[in-house]
Protein backbone atom coordinates (compact mmCIF):
# COMPACT_ATOMS: atom_id res chain seq x y z
CA UNK A 1 0.00 0.00 0.00
CA UNK A 2 0.98 3.58 -0.50
CA UNK A 3 1.85 6.15 2.16
CA UNK A 4 3.45 9.55 2.67
CA UNK A 5 6.50 10.22 4.82
CA UNK A 6 6.25 13.17 7.18
CA UNK A 7 9.11 14.84 9.01
CA UNK A 8 9.40 18.04 11.03
CA UNK A 9 8.31 21.08 9.02
CA UNK A 10 10.63 23.52 10.78
CA UNK A 11 14.38 23.23 11.34
CA UNK A 12 15.35 21.31 14.47
CA UNK A 13 17.85 23.11 16.67
CA UNK A 14 20.63 21.38 18.58
CA UNK A 15 23.62 22.42 20.66
CA UNK A 16 27.07 21.15 19.78
CA UNK A 17 27.96 18.30 22.14
CA UNK A 18 24.34 17.56 23.01
CA UNK A 19 22.03 14.95 21.52
CA UNK A 20 19.17 15.62 19.14
CA UNK A 21 16.13 13.67 17.96
CA UNK A 22 14.82 13.72 14.40
CA UNK A 23 11.27 12.32 14.18
CA UNK A 24 9.80 10.73 11.06
CA UNK A 25 6.51 8.92 10.38
CA UNK A 26 4.34 7.50 7.65
CA UNK A 27 0.77 8.55 6.94
CA UNK A 28 -1.57 6.84 7.14
CA UNK A 29 0.08 5.19 10.11
CA UNK A 30 0.73 1.46 9.85
CA UNK A 31 3.17 -1.14 11.09
CA UNK A 32 6.63 -0.42 9.65
CA UNK A 33 8.50 -3.22 11.44
CA UNK A 34 9.04 -5.06 8.17
CA UNK A 35 10.01 -1.98 6.21
CA UNK A 36 13.43 -0.56 5.47
CA UNK A 37 13.83 2.74 7.31
CA UNK A 38 16.76 5.06 7.08
CA UNK A 39 18.30 8.50 7.13
CA UNK A 40 20.84 9.81 4.67
CA UNK A 41 22.40 13.18 3.97
CA UNK A 42 22.05 14.82 0.60
CA UNK A 43 23.65 15.60 -1.77
CA UNK A 44 25.98 12.58 -1.58
CA UNK A 45 23.57 10.20 0.14
CA UNK A 46 25.91 9.43 3.01
CA UNK A 47 24.13 6.92 5.24
CA UNK A 48 23.38 8.26 8.71
CA UNK A 49 21.38 5.24 9.92
CA UNK A 50 19.79 2.23 8.26
CA UNK A 51 17.25 -0.25 9.62
CA UNK A 52 16.57 -3.32 7.49
CA UNK A 53 15.27 -6.85 8.08
CA UNK A 54 14.36 -5.88 11.63
CA UNK A 55 17.94 -4.84 12.47
CA UNK A 56 20.12 -1.75 12.48
CA UNK A 57 22.69 -2.05 9.68
CA UNK A 58 25.74 -0.49 11.30
CA UNK A 59 28.10 -1.55 8.53
CA UNK A 60 26.46 0.79 6.03
CA UNK A 61 26.91 3.92 8.14
CA UNK A 62 29.17 6.81 7.19
CA UNK A 63 32.13 6.76 9.62
CA UNK A 64 31.22 10.12 11.16
CA UNK A 65 27.93 8.66 12.42
CA UNK A 66 29.19 5.27 13.58
CA UNK A 67 28.44 4.86 17.27
CA UNK A 68 26.60 8.18 17.47
CA UNK A 69 23.11 7.21 16.28
CA UNK A 70 20.20 5.22 17.65
CA UNK A 71 16.86 4.49 16.03
CA UNK A 72 14.04 4.79 18.56
CA UNK A 73 11.50 2.18 17.48
CA UNK A 74 8.98 2.21 20.34
CA UNK A 75 6.21 3.35 17.98
CA UNK A 76 7.36 1.62 14.80
CA UNK A 77 4.18 -0.45 14.96
CA UNK A 78 2.30 2.78 14.23
CA UNK A 79 4.77 3.88 11.55
CA UNK A 80 6.64 6.33 13.78
CA UNK A 81 10.40 6.34 14.36
CA UNK A 82 12.92 8.83 15.72
CA UNK A 83 16.62 9.08 14.97
CA UNK A 84 18.74 10.11 17.96
CA UNK A 85 22.15 11.61 17.23
CA UNK A 86 24.57 11.91 20.15
CA UNK A 87 27.46 14.35 20.61
CA UNK A 88 26.21 16.72 17.92
CA UNK A 89 28.92 18.27 15.77
CA UNK A 90 29.02 21.43 13.71
CA UNK A 91 29.26 19.26 10.59
CA UNK A 92 25.85 17.73 11.42
CA UNK A 93 24.23 21.03 10.44
CA UNK A 94 22.21 20.90 7.24
CA UNK A 95 19.80 18.59 5.48
CA UNK A 96 18.76 15.05 6.38
CA UNK A 97 16.40 12.79 4.45
CA UNK A 98 14.30 10.11 6.12
CA UNK A 99 12.85 7.29 4.01
CA UNK A 100 10.57 4.29 4.41
CA UNK A 101 10.73 1.48 1.85
CA UNK A 102 8.05 -1.20 1.63
CA UNK A 103 9.14 -3.76 -0.97
CA UNK A 104 9.60 -1.63 -4.10
CA UNK A 105 7.63 1.37 -2.86
CA UNK A 106 9.64 4.15 -1.25
CA UNK A 107 8.80 7.62 0.02
CA UNK A 108 10.96 10.14 1.84
CA UNK A 109 10.89 13.44 3.68
CA UNK A 110 13.55 16.13 4.02
CA UNK A 111 14.36 17.89 7.28
CA UNK A 112 16.93 20.40 8.47
CA UNK A 113 19.18 20.49 11.52
CA UNK A 114 20.62 23.73 12.87
CA UNK A 115 23.64 23.38 15.17
CA UNK A 116 24.37 26.16 17.64
CA UNK A 117 27.30 26.85 19.93
CA UNK A 118 26.21 26.93 23.59
CA UNK A 119 29.54 28.24 24.78
CA UNK A 120 29.39 31.80 23.53
CA UNK A 121 26.87 34.52 24.31
CA UNK A 122 26.74 35.44 20.64
CA UNK A 123 27.96 32.69 18.31
CA UNK A 124 31.32 34.01 17.07
CA UNK A 125 32.73 33.96 13.58
Amino acid sequence: GQFRVIGPRHPIRALVGDEVELPCRISPGKNATGMEVGWYRPPFSRVVHLYRNGKDQDGDQAPEYRGRTELLKDAIGEGKVTLRIRNVRFSDEGGFTCFFRDHSYQEEAAMELKVEDPFYWVSPG
Epitope: G17, F90, S91, F119, P124
Partner: antibody
Framework: QVQLQESGGGVVQPGRSLRLSCAAS????????MHWVRQAPGKGLEWVAV????????YYADSVKGRFTISRDNAKNTLYLQMNSLRAEDTAVYYC??????????WGQGTMVTVSS | DIQMTQSPSTLTASVGDRVTVTCRAS??????LAWYQQKPGKAPKLLIY???SLDSGVPSRFSGSGSGTEFTLTISSLQPDDFATYYC?????????FGRGTKVEIK
Protein backbone atom coordinates in the same frame (compact mmCIF):
# COMPACT_ATOMS: atom_id res chain seq x y z
CA GLN B 1 45.14 44.85 25.60
CA VAL B 2 43.63 41.36 25.40
CA GLN B 3 45.32 39.12 27.95
CA LEU B 4 45.04 35.83 29.81
CA GLN B 5 47.29 35.15 32.79
CA GLU B 6 47.47 31.72 34.45
CA SER B 7 48.65 31.10 38.00
CA GLY B 8 48.59 28.39 40.65
CA GLY B 9 51.01 25.88 39.16
CA GLY B 10 53.69 24.14 41.18
CA VAL B 11 54.99 20.81 42.40
CA VAL B 12 52.45 18.48 43.98
CA GLN B 13 52.48 14.86 45.14
CA PRO B 14 50.42 12.20 43.35
CA GLY B 15 46.89 11.98 44.70
CA ARG B 16 46.90 15.58 45.93
CA SER B 17 44.97 18.59 44.58
CA LEU B 18 45.79 21.89 42.97
CA ARG B 19 43.70 24.81 41.71
CA LEU B 20 44.75 26.84 38.68
CA SER B 21 43.45 30.33 37.94
CA CYS B 22 43.32 32.32 34.73
CA ALA B 23 42.76 36.08 34.95
CA ALA B 24 41.28 37.70 31.84
CA SER B 25 41.48 41.32 30.76
CA UNK B 26 40.92 43.45 27.67
CA UNK B 27 37.79 41.66 26.41
CA UNK B 28 34.25 40.86 27.55
CA UNK B 29 35.09 37.72 29.53
CA UNK B 30 31.43 36.97 30.31
CA UNK B 31 30.62 36.52 26.59
CA UNK B 32 33.22 33.87 25.87
CA UNK B 33 33.50 30.15 26.32
CA MET B 34 36.82 29.36 28.02
CA HIS B 35 39.10 26.36 27.60
CA TRP B 36 42.03 24.69 29.31
CA VAL B 37 44.69 23.08 27.12
CA ARG B 38 47.79 21.31 28.43
CA GLN B 39 51.17 20.25 27.09
CA ALA B 40 53.31 17.59 28.74
CA PRO B 41 57.08 18.21 28.58
CA GLY B 42 58.33 17.57 25.03
CA LYS B 43 54.85 16.50 23.88
CA GLY B 44 51.98 17.93 21.86
CA LEU B 45 48.89 19.91 22.83
CA GLU B 46 45.95 18.24 24.59
CA TRP B 47 42.55 19.87 25.06
CA VAL B 48 41.37 19.45 28.67
CA ALA B 49 38.03 21.19 29.28
CA VAL B 50 35.62 23.92 28.25
CA UNK B 51 33.05 26.01 30.11
CA UNK B 52 30.28 28.09 28.58
CA UNK B 53 30.12 31.89 28.90
CA UNK B 54 27.69 31.65 31.84
CA UNK B 55 29.19 28.56 33.49
CA UNK B 56 26.12 26.40 32.83
CA UNK B 57 27.73 23.95 30.41
CA UNK B 58 31.00 22.06 30.73
CA TYR B 59 32.81 19.32 28.79
CA TYR B 60 35.94 17.41 29.71
CA ALA B 61 38.53 15.22 28.04
CA ASP B 62 38.14 11.56 29.08
CA SER B 63 41.62 11.66 30.63
CA VAL B 64 40.50 14.15 33.32
CA LYS B 65 36.76 13.43 33.63
CA GLY B 66 35.74 12.93 37.26
CA ARG B 67 39.00 14.39 38.57
CA PHE B 68 39.13 17.93 37.18
CA THR B 69 36.46 20.62 37.48
CA ILE B 70 36.35 23.75 35.36
CA SER B 71 34.57 26.82 36.74
CA ARG B 72 34.48 30.58 36.32
CA ASP B 73 33.66 33.78 38.19
CA ASN B 74 32.48 36.38 35.69
CA ALA B 75 32.42 39.08 38.36
CA LYS B 76 36.17 38.55 38.82
CA ASN B 77 36.94 37.82 35.14
CA THR B 78 38.60 34.62 36.27
CA LEU B 79 38.62 31.02 35.05
CA TYR B 80 39.55 28.09 37.33
CA LEU B 81 40.64 24.49 37.02
CA GLN B 82 40.32 22.39 40.18
CA MET B 83 42.56 19.34 39.78
CA ASN B 84 42.04 16.44 42.19
CA SER B 85 43.62 12.98 42.43
CA LEU B 86 46.59 14.19 40.43
CA ARG B 87 48.75 11.67 38.57
CA ALA B 88 52.26 11.79 37.15
CA GLU B 89 50.74 11.93 33.64
CA ASP B 90 49.04 15.24 34.54
CA THR B 91 52.47 16.89 34.60
CA ALA B 92 52.27 19.62 31.96
CA VAL B 93 52.13 23.29 31.17
CA TYR B 94 48.48 24.32 31.49
CA TYR B 95 47.17 27.08 29.22
CA CYS B 96 43.83 28.85 29.30
CA UNK B 97 42.57 29.83 25.88
CA UNK B 98 39.60 31.31 24.04
CA UNK B 99 38.78 33.01 20.78
CA UNK B 100 36.12 34.60 18.65
CA UNK B 101 36.39 32.24 15.69
CA UNK B 102 35.88 28.96 17.63
CA UNK B 103 39.63 28.49 17.18
CA UNK B 104 41.88 29.73 19.99
CA UNK B 105 43.28 33.14 19.12
CA UNK B 106 43.85 34.19 22.74
CA TRP B 107 46.21 32.16 24.95
CA GLY B 108 47.77 32.66 28.34
CA GLN B 109 51.51 32.18 28.84
CA GLY B 110 50.93 28.89 30.70
CA THR B 111 51.59 27.62 34.22
CA MET B 112 53.64 24.51 34.96
CA VAL B 113 52.20 21.68 37.04
CA THR B 114 54.58 18.95 38.17
CA VAL B 115 53.16 15.84 39.84
CA SER B 116 55.95 14.00 41.58
CA SER B 117 56.66 12.25 44.84
CA ASP C 1 36.65 10.91 19.05
CA ILE C 2 38.06 12.47 15.91
CA GLN C 3 41.74 11.62 15.43
CA MET C 4 44.02 14.13 13.71
CA THR C 5 47.04 12.69 11.90
CA GLN C 6 49.77 15.15 10.99
CA SER C 7 52.69 14.54 8.65
CA PRO C 8 55.59 14.74 8.56
CA SER C 9 56.54 14.80 12.24
CA THR C 10 59.78 16.62 11.40
CA LEU C 11 60.64 18.66 8.34
CA THR C 12 64.09 20.00 7.52
CA ALA C 13 64.14 22.99 5.19
CA SER C 14 66.09 26.08 4.19
CA VAL C 15 65.14 29.75 4.21
CA GLY C 16 63.20 30.50 1.03
CA ASP C 17 61.85 26.94 0.66
CA ARG C 18 58.20 26.19 0.05
CA VAL C 19 56.98 24.02 2.91
CA THR C 20 53.84 21.90 3.14
CA VAL C 21 52.37 20.21 6.23
CA THR C 22 49.45 17.79 5.94
CA CYS C 23 46.71 17.00 8.42
CA ARG C 24 44.15 14.21 8.04
CA ALA C 25 40.98 13.87 10.14
CA SER C 26 39.63 10.38 10.90
CA UNK C 27 36.11 11.63 10.07
CA UNK C 28 34.76 14.56 8.12
CA UNK C 29 35.08 17.91 9.88
CA UNK C 30 33.99 20.09 6.95
CA UNK C 31 36.22 23.16 7.34
CA UNK C 32 36.36 23.29 11.15
CA LEU C 33 40.15 23.20 11.30
CA ALA C 34 42.79 25.54 12.75
CA TRP C 35 46.57 25.69 12.42
CA TYR C 36 48.86 26.95 15.22
CA GLN C 37 52.52 27.83 15.42
CA GLN C 38 54.44 27.24 18.65
CA LYS C 39 57.97 28.22 19.58
CA PRO C 40 59.87 26.68 22.53
CA GLY C 41 58.69 27.99 25.89
CA LYS C 42 55.87 30.00 24.33
CA ALA C 43 52.10 29.59 23.99
CA PRO C 44 50.74 28.49 20.61
CA LYS C 45 49.75 31.22 18.15
CA LEU C 46 46.75 30.92 15.85
CA LEU C 47 47.69 31.13 12.16
CA ILE C 48 44.65 29.86 10.28
CA TYR C 49 41.04 29.10 11.17
CA UNK C 50 38.17 27.60 9.16
CA UNK C 51 40.83 25.69 7.18
CA UNK C 52 41.90 28.66 5.04
CA SER C 53 41.16 31.97 6.82
CA LEU C 54 44.31 33.82 7.86
CA ASP C 55 44.20 35.24 11.39
CA SER C 56 44.85 38.96 11.70
CA GLY C 57 48.52 39.90 11.63
CA VAL C 58 49.65 36.57 10.15
CA PRO C 59 51.96 37.01 7.13
CA SER C 60 50.46 36.14 3.75
CA ARG C 61 53.17 33.54 3.08
CA PHE C 62 51.06 31.24 5.29
CA SER C 63 48.05 29.62 3.65
CA GLY C 64 45.68 26.78 4.42
CA SER C 65 43.51 24.61 2.23
CA GLY C 66 41.31 21.54 2.37
CA SER C 67 37.89 20.39 3.45
CA GLY C 68 36.32 17.22 4.79
CA THR C 69 39.23 15.09 5.99
CA GLU C 70 42.33 16.35 4.13
CA PHE C 71 44.03 19.65 5.00
CA THR C 72 47.26 21.41 4.14
CA LEU C 73 49.30 24.23 5.65
CA THR C 74 51.69 25.86 3.20
CA ILE C 75 54.49 28.35 3.83
CA SER C 76 55.30 29.79 0.42
CA SER C 77 58.80 31.04 1.28
CA LEU C 78 60.21 29.95 4.62
CA GLN C 79 61.62 32.76 6.77
CA PRO C 80 64.01 32.50 9.76
CA ASP C 81 61.12 33.34 12.10
CA ASP C 82 59.09 30.35 10.81
CA PHE C 83 61.26 27.63 12.36
CA ALA C 84 58.83 26.27 14.96
CA THR C 85 56.36 23.46 15.61
CA TYR C 86 53.00 23.53 13.82
CA TYR C 87 49.80 21.90 15.06
CA CYS C 88 46.45 21.32 13.41
CA UNK C 89 43.28 21.16 15.52
CA UNK C 90 39.70 20.20 14.75
CA UNK C 91 36.91 22.12 16.42
CA UNK C 92 34.01 20.39 14.75
CA UNK C 93 33.24 18.28 17.82
CA UNK C 94 34.06 17.70 21.46
CA UNK C 95 36.57 16.64 22.55
CA UNK C 96 38.60 19.04 20.49
CA UNK C 97 41.68 17.24 19.21
CA PHE C 98 45.11 18.29 17.96
CA GLY C 99 47.55 16.67 15.60
CA ARG C 100 50.86 15.54 17.11
CA GLY C 101 52.74 18.43 15.58
CA THR C 102 55.27 19.05 12.81
CA LYS C 103 58.64 20.47 13.79
CA VAL C 104 60.17 22.63 11.06
CA GLU C 105 63.96 22.64 11.48
CA ILE C 106 66.77 24.49 9.72
CA LYS C 107 68.67 22.43 7.15
Amino acid sequence: QVQLQESGGGVVQPGRSLRLSCAASGFTFSSYGMHWVRQAPGKGLEWVAVISYDGSKKYYADSVKGRFTISRDNAKNTLYLQMNSLRAEDTAVYYCATGNSHAFDIWGQGTMVTVSS
Amino acid sequence: DIQMTQSPSTLTASVGDRVTVTCRASQTINRWLAWYQQKPGKAPKLLIYLASSLDSGVPSRFSGSGSGTEFTLTISSLQPDDFATYYCQQYNAYPRTFGRGTKVEIK
